[in-house]
């Protein structure tokens, strides 16, 4: 067989046997010659350089460019190829010889006792067992151990060339420890060298740093990094690392493999880092490196060495927070630090402590924002070690958009009787206040009568085409009276009127309201009615138990069928239609009630009367009455407020309190309820009774002692009480000094 | 700067041994692994050997295993490449290139081994 | 071992056209982790390989932005858009998802 290019000049050198395979008994002596144009020379197998006593490589006798190569008793370890090629150049002829030695079959490598095969455990892959034979057809299996196992030649994937070795899938032998090939010549089994089977991986699949970041310690303490790298199974890992002062005499390295679960496909290698007395000149870029051989990674953090423990504000950290109401608000504590600082949030001095609404950590986050979360917010951070605190004032405060009072009253509103003067209002609670409150109106049939658009919970009133108030042409003259600010339950509120001179005609009115935050707005049906009217009896809000009549008056002579009837809860209708009040056109959602008519000259009055009201009987009443000419209904409807029943409390500032003889003693109790309480004062639990010293005032509510003696002296109690019980708040009342005696002075006396 | 400088290329016999020595500087040579390439006379690159930072680990080509160790000196900031056994298909430009990630980022200009009688 | 072909082995270009180089490989590059394992290098004449790109995708640094790698599991591409005089030389793949890593036989690209 020839080897290389071919040259211009140079034919191949020729071998004295012209044959690709040679195949010789052991034993016998092997001599080849080899002729060729210019300097030539002799591989020959094993021993790959001129160094081998047995072989002799001798010039020719009979020409120039002509050398023999000869070996005496050869031996199956002889079995191979020989090379015969020109100096310098690619140009060789090779002849492969099988030297057959059936004691020994397989060729040994000189030097090893043992041989080694790397593998991967990779499905895909091969490996060659160099057992290479001294005979071309043998029968050869491969043994694995241990566990025992025999691998037979399958004419696929498992193969045995004399020339190469026994190649199989290398995962099949990735268990094994050791593995030798065996052949058999006339039932006697022969075997190769021992192969040491060294399953090797590579491939680190990351290299992780704890802790990985915002490392930060002060002079003195104690550095601990764990590097630790994850590798496919079968890996070695050498580590290093590199970090500012490198020669430290204080470090300690410690490298070990992780446990894994069995099962795992993964390795765990750590390398630790320990720095004890870390010193300033050690802050810095701290890497970390895993390397395998043919894969490195590295990982790198950054170590910050303080002089000493300190806390103190970040610039970023902010003063005034604004937020909307049922917002998240996150007020983060923006702190630079070491160690990390306790962190405590105060509210208007008070601590505030974590619940389902507010998180109290390193972020204040409180869930939903209402007006009773504005304040002055105050974070205490403390340093940990050493002691030192730090405090900053936040300011929240919450914007409400707009919100109108009346807007809760969601039923059909009263109707208004015709001709009469009206006064409609919004009632708008916001903050900042609204910087306006417009009025628009529409007439009622413009706006209930448009079957094409559909109606929504949030918008019942789908009307488009609302006009100004300052344009009232085709509708009732309409003055606005100027914003008015009052403080309602508590809060400062602007209250805007709207002032209808004449209710001549059906309309929608809706006040709108904007502020910096957002708008709101409140639409009235007012619905003007030229049919009865009702009245309420006593006219005042009836409370739970009281008794209360609703009285419909109506002119005899244009008025027949006067009926009461109940508005029931309705599901809001469908179509725009039906809206907003017309119920007359909607008799299902009534409910007929039983009554009683009057009749006096000119009218007729029919009373439905309510004894004992609960809070079932608020609600919408509808007076129906027909129209005797034309057999038109006429409706008006008055809604019922039920007043619940409530026990009487008490506020007021009656405490403990010491006053000199002769002067006054001045304290109020104020009480609240439904039916509202009667007030009563007792000293030393017996009634006290106004005369020239003690004045009781404002329904009892005010309690005035003038000159007090030293008799006056006592426990004083206020008690309120009504049909649901009492109430009582109690005070001592110590007198200091001495009584002056003189008869100008007519004193009162209790009892 | 990265550098790598390859030296003690030649021409020697088959049979013979050469000690190739890459010199690196610019970086911190204890935190990467080596590796030596190499490309025969209008060849592809052929990947040699390779060695983990620490030295520990080495991986070699069917083709040189056995004959050839990749070794480095850490205090000297060097790599290392005995070749044993040289045989003519040894002869190529041997390159050695820095390796983070298994990928070769830098590599040296080369030195050229001869094997020839 | 992983065979790696590449096509064309010689590409003559003029100074601002866009070219492609493709890469096969025997084995699918595409790791259990979810990477493929394939690199680009240039080697421009006289000098040593230049990492070009890594990851099958990702440009090393200092590499210009003509320069894109995109593939499968076993066909590559690196495509050079807008091609430079400084572009010349050889361009090879190098697969590293399993050992020995190969490289490919090598394009040579050259100005027409």
């Known amino acids: 067989a020839s080897v290389g290019l071919p040259s211009v000049s140079l034919d191949l050198p020729r071998l004295s046997i012209q044959k690709d395979i040679l195949t010789i008994k052991a034993n016998t002596t092997l001599q080849i010659t080899c002729r060729g144009q210019r300097d030539l020379d002799w591989l020959w197998p094993n021993n790959q350089s001129g160094s081998e006593q047995r072989v002799e490589v001798t010039e020719c006798s009979d020409g120039l460019f002509c050398k023999t190569l000869t070996i005496p008793k050869v031996i199956g370890n002889d079995t191979g190829a020989y090379k015969c090629f020109y100096r310098e150049t690619d140009l060789a002829s090779v002849i492969y010889v099988y030297v057959q030695d059936y004691r020994s079959p397989f060729i040994a490598s000189v030097s090893d006792q043992h041989g080694v095969v790397y593998i991967t455990e990779n499905k895909n892959k091969t490996v060659v067992i160099p057992c290479l034979g001294s005979i071309s057809n043998l029968n050869v299996s491969l043994c694995a151990r241990y566990p025992e196992k025999r691998f037979v030649p399958d004419g696929n994937r498992i193969s045995w060339d004399s020339k190469k070795g026994f190649t199989i899938p290398s995962y099949m032998i990735s268990y094994a420890g050791m593995v030798f090939c065996e052949a058999k010549i006339n039932d006697e089994s022969y075997q190769s060298i021992m192969y040491i089977v060294v399953v090797v991986g590579y491939r680190i699949y990351d290299v992780v740093l704890s802790p990985s970041h915002g490392i930060e310690l002060s002079v003195g303490e104690k550095l601990v990094l764990n590097c630790t790298a994850r590798t496919e199974l079968n890996v070695g890992i050498d580590f290093n690392w590199e970090y500012p002062s490198s020669k430290h005499q204080h470090k300690k390295l410690v490298n070990r493999d992780l446990k894994t679960q069995s099962g795992s496909e993964m390795k765990k290698f750590l390398s630790t880092l320990t720095i004890d007395g870390i010193t300033r000149s050690d802050q810095g870029l701290y890497t970390c490196a895993a390397s395998s051989g043919l894969m490195t990674k590295k990982n790198s953090t950054f170590v910050r060495v303080h002089e000493k423990p300190f806390v103190a504000f970040g610039s970023g950290m902010e003063s005034l927070v604004e937020a909307t109401v049922g917002e998240r608000v996150r007020i983060p504590a923006k702190y630079l630090g070491y160690p990390p600082p306790e962190i405590k949030w105060y509210k208007n001095g008070i601590p505030l402590e974590s619940n389902h609404t507010i998180k109290a950590g390193h972020v204040l986050t409180i869930m939903e924002v209402s007006e009773r979360d504005t304040g002055n917010y105050t974070v205490i951070l403390t340093n940990p070690i050493s002691k030192e605190k730090q405090s900053h004032v936040v300011s929240l405060v919450v914007y409400v958009p707009p919100q109108i009072g009346e807007k809760s009253l969601i039923s059909p509103v009263d109707s208004y009787q015709y001709g009469t003067t009206q006064t409609l209002t919004c009632t708008v609670y916001a903050i900042p206040p609204p910087h306006h409150i417009h009025w628009y109106w529409q007439l009622e049939e413009e706006c209930a009568n448009e079957p094409s658009h559909a109606v929504s919970v949030t918008n019942p009133y789908p009307c488009e085409e609302w006009r100004s108030v300052e344009d009232f042409q085709g509708g009732n003259k309409i003055e606005v009276n100027k914003n008015q600010f009052a403080l309602i339950e508590g809060k400062n509120k602007t209250v805007s009127t709207l002032v209808i001179q004449a209710a001549n005609v059906s309309a929608l009115y809706k006040c709108e309201a904007v502020n910096k935050v957002g708008r709101g707005e409140r639409v009235i049906s007012f619905h003007v009615t030229r049919g009865p009217e009702i009245t309420l009896q006593p006219d005042m809000q009836p409370t739970e138990q009281e008794s209360v009549s609703l009285w419909c008056t109506a002119d005899r002579s244009t008025f027949e069928n006067l009926t009461w009837y109940k508005l029931g809860p309705q599901p809001l209708p469908i179509h725009v239609g039906e809206l907003p009040t017309p119920v007359c056109k909607n008799l299902d959602t009534l409910w007929k009630l039983n009554a009683t008519m009057f009749s006096n000259s000119t009218n007729d009055i029919l009373i439905m009367e309510l004894k004992n009201a609960s809070l079932q009987d608020q609600g919408d009443y509808v007076c129906l009455a027909q129209d005797r000419k034309t057999k038109k209904r006429h409706c008006v409807v008055r809604q019922l407020t039920v007043l619940e029943r409530v026990a009487p409390t008490i506020t007021g500032n009656l405490e403990n309190q010491t006053t000199s003889i002769g002067e006054s003693i001045e304290v109020s109790c104020t009480a609240s309820g439904n039916p509202p309480p009667q007030i009563m004062w007792f000293k030393d639990n017996e009634t006290l009774v106004e005369d020239s010293g003690i004045v009781l005032k404002d329904g009892n509510r005010n309690l005035t002692i003038r000159r007090v003696r030293k008799e006056d002296e006592g426990l004083y109690t206020c008690q309120a009480c009504s049909v649901l019980g009492c109430a009582k708040v109690e005070a001592f009342f110590i007198i200091e000094g001495a009584q002056e005696k003189t008869n100008l002075e007519h004193h009162h006396h209790h009892h | 700067e990265v550098q790598l400088v390859e030296s003690g290329g030649g021409l020697v016999k088959p049979g013979g041994s050469l000690r190739l020595s890459c010199a690196a500087s610019g970086f911190t040579f204890s935190m990467y692994g080596m590796s030596w390439v190499r490309q025969a006379p209008g060849k592809r690159l052929e990947w040699v050997a390779s060695?983990?930072?620490?030295?520990?680990?080495?991986y070699y080509a069917d083709s040189v295993k056995g004959r050839f160790t990749i070794s480095r000196d850490n205090a000297k900031n060097t790599l290392y490449l005995q070749m044993n056994s040289l045989r003519a298909e040894d002869t190529a430009v041997y390159y050695c290139?820095?390796?983070?990630?298994?990928?070769?980022?830098?590599w040296g200009q080369g030195t050229t081994l001869t094997v020839s009688s | 071992d992983i065979v790696i072909t590449q096509t064309p082995l010689s590409l003559p270009v003029t100074p601002g056209e866009s070219v492609s180089i493709s890469c096969r490989s025997s084995?699918?590059?595409?790791?259990?982790?979810?990477?493929?394992?394939l690199n680009w290098f240039l080697q421009r004449p006289g000098q040593s390989p230049q990492l070009l790109i890594y990851?099958?995708?990702t440009r090393a640094s200092g590499v210009p932005d003509r320069f894109s790698g995109s593939g499968s599991g076993t066909d590559f591409t690196l495509k050079i858009s807008r091609v430079e005089a400084e572009d010349v030389g050889v361009y090879y793949c190098q697969q590293l998802v399993e050992y020995p890593f190969t490289f490919g036989s090598g394009t040579k690209l050259e100005i027409k």
């Open positions: 084995k699918s590059l595409l790791y259990k982790d979810g990477k493929t394992y």
């Open positions: 290139a820095r390796e983070l990630d298994g990928n070769y980022d830098y």
């Open positions: 060695i983990s930072i620490g030295g520990s680990y080495t």
């Open positions: 990851l099958m995708s």
